[in-house]
């Protein structure tokens, strides 16, 4: 799913207020809901009919530093016999997410939001048209 | 996938530098990669063997204001005949993502990161145990 553009309103003060100095704003330390948990079914990436693997990318100047990307293992989907069914296709489910980029020069540290496209997993679909013309 | 805890390091300046004043830091306006595109406008949610619907939540004090949540339509998966196969399960694929929460009192505006759990779509899995004993 796509994150809409910021436009020029969300990060600005109300019109009646003095503008934000220097094109930056105040970000409070700490994260709301930091301790919430993901309750994903166990090993769904291996048990799915459109199974996937995970690759971890690491960047110490990004929060979260670890971003996990899924890659579908097959082109087709896995049938009840454990064979690849080529009439169905394993397709990636993608999600735009925000990360925070840290930029520093000496003791001057600033942060900026960054959009990252994450493949979260795969699902099995029926192509609209089965064959080329 | 789970976002690790911030700990006490990412948003802090190096030890040799003066501490961040008032528990806040500088967030630059603008978003890196704002124009990148998601190629997901293909109705996979309807054509998946584990189809899902979308619900949009809206909050003007959150960026992005619109957060889309998926809900699996069925317990089972849809077979080639378009019928629900209850030997297989439709399960949600969840992803922790960051949003920005806006807090304001008069002209004093600050922002804080918030973790949100998003269901991105669904996938069809083989249950670990098919039948109770």
């Amino acid at each position: 799913r796509k994150i809409p553009k910021v436009g020029h309103t969300f990060f600005q003060k109300p019109e009646s207020c003095p503008p934000v100095p220097g094109g930056s704003m105040k970000l409070d330390i700490g994260i709301i809901n930091e301790n919430q948990r993901v309750s994903m079914s166990r090993n769904i990436e291996s048990r799915s009919t459109s199974p996937w693997n995970y690759t971890v990318t690491w960047d110490p100047n990004r929060y979260p530093s670890e971003v996990v990307q899924a890659q579908c293992r097959n082109l087709g989907c896995i049938n009840a016999q454990g064979k690849e069914d080529i009439s169905m296709n394993s397709v990636p489910i993608q999600q735009e997410t925000l990360v925070v980029r840290r930029k520093h020069q000496g003791c001057s540290v600033s942060f900026q939001l960054e959009k990252v496209l994450v493949t979260v997993g795969c699902t099995c679909v029926t192509p609209v048209i089965h064959h080329v013309q | 996938r789970k976002i690790p805890k911030v700990g006490h390091t990412f948003f802090q300046k190096p030890e040799s530098c003066p501490p961040v004043p008032g528990g806040s830091m500088k967030l630059d306006i603008g978003i890196i990669n704002e124009n990148q595109r998601v190629s997901m406008s293909r109705n996979i949610e309807s054509r998946s063997t584990s189809p899902w619907n979308y619900t949009v939540t809206w909050d003007p004090n959150r960026y992005p204001s619109e957060v889309v949540q998926a809900q699996c339509r069925n317990l089972g998966c849809i077979n080639a005949q378009g019928k629900e196969d209850i030997s297989m399960n439709s399960v949600p694929i969840q992803q922790e993502t960051l949003v920005v929460r806006r807090k304001h009192q008069g002209c004093s505006v600050s922002f804080q990161l918030e973790k949100v759990l998003v269901t991105v779509g669904c996938t069809c899995v083989t249950p670990v145990i098919h039948h109770v004993q």
Epitope: W52, N53, Q71, C72, R73, N74, L75, G76, K83, E84, D85, I86, S87, N89, S90, V91, P92, T119, C122, V125, P127, V128, I129, H130, H131, V132 | S39, R42, I44, R47
Partner: antibody, heavy 123, light 106 residues
Framework: QVQLVQSGAEVKKPGASVKVSCKAS????????MHWVKQSHGQRLEWMGG????????SYNQNFKGKATLTVDTSASTAYMELSSLRSEDTAVYYC????????????????WGQGTTVTVSS | DIQMTQSPSSLSASVGDRVTITCSAS?????MHWYQQKPGKVPKLLIY???KLASGVPSRFSGSGSGTDFTLTISSLQPEDVATYYC?????????FGQGTKLEIK
């Protein structure tokens, strides 16, 4: 228009490896699968496998598992097929061929073909 | 794997003749494709989904069949039809092709 341009002919010694490239143009590379087909001395066509540049998904013909490795470089819109431990029976013309996008056409539907790359294995 | 057997392996016919090539699958398949490969050229899709004509293919070509037995027919052979014809099953992994039928003009 869609074009698939393959690398030139190769002559290799038994036991060596070879990597054949297929440069795509005229469409969005990431959105379509790429397949590889072997044709030995003008005879039967054998589907070797296919790869989805977007999802990373790969499907191999079991007969070519361990023999062929399919990869892509999305930034260069190029697909690669590497053959290892070459033997005389690997002497053939190898074709890359574009498959479907998985959404509107099936991944396994082949529409456009490269011009073919001749690999000769000889001591 | 599904084995595809074409017959005949080669045939010679006169311009204007009706030509039939058959393809037999080792087990039932839903769809059959037919490819034409002219000497020194790349394969070209001729018929897809058993009976549908691919874009730009002359109407003298037609396909039929179901289950395990499929047929490619050229209603009136033309000199430019000299080629090797391959059937390909699109049903079961892996994709498999027939061994080819080489068509020549008498």
């Amino acid at each position: 228009q869609v074009q698939l341009v393959q690398s030139g002919a190769e002559v290799k010694k038994p036991g060596a490896s070879v990597k054949v490239s297929c440069k795509a143009s005229g469409y969005t590379f990431n959105e379509y699968t790429m397949h590889w087909v072997k044709q030995s001395h003008g005879q039967r066509l054998e589907w070797m496998g296919g790869i989805n540049p977007n999802s990373g998904g790969v499907s191999y013909n079991q007969n070519f598992k361990g023999k062929a490795t399919l990869t892509v470089d999305t930034s260069a819109s190029t697909a690669y097929m590497e053959l290892s431990s070459l033997r005389s029976e690997d002497t053939a013309v190898y074709y890359c061929a574009r498959g479907g996008d998985g959404y509107y056409t099936n991944y396994f539907d082949i529409d456009y073909w490269g011009q073919g790359t001749t690999v000769t294995v000889s001591s | 794997d599904i084995q595809m057997t074409q017959s005949p392996s080669s045939l010679s016919a006169s311009v204007g003749d009706r030509v039939t090539i058959t393809c037999s699958a080792s087990s039932s398949v839903n769809y059959m494709h037919w490819y034409q490969q002219k000497p020194g050229k790349v394969p070209k899709l001729l018929i897809y989904d058993t009976s549908k004509l691919a874009s730009g293919v002359p109407s003298r070509f037609s396909g039929s069949g179901s289950g395990t037995d499929f047929t490619l027919t050229i209603s009136s052979l033309q000199p430019e039809d000299v080629a090797t014809y391959y059937c390909q099953q699109w049903n079961s992994h892996p994709l498999t092709f027939g061994q080819g039928t080489k068509l020549e003009i008498k």
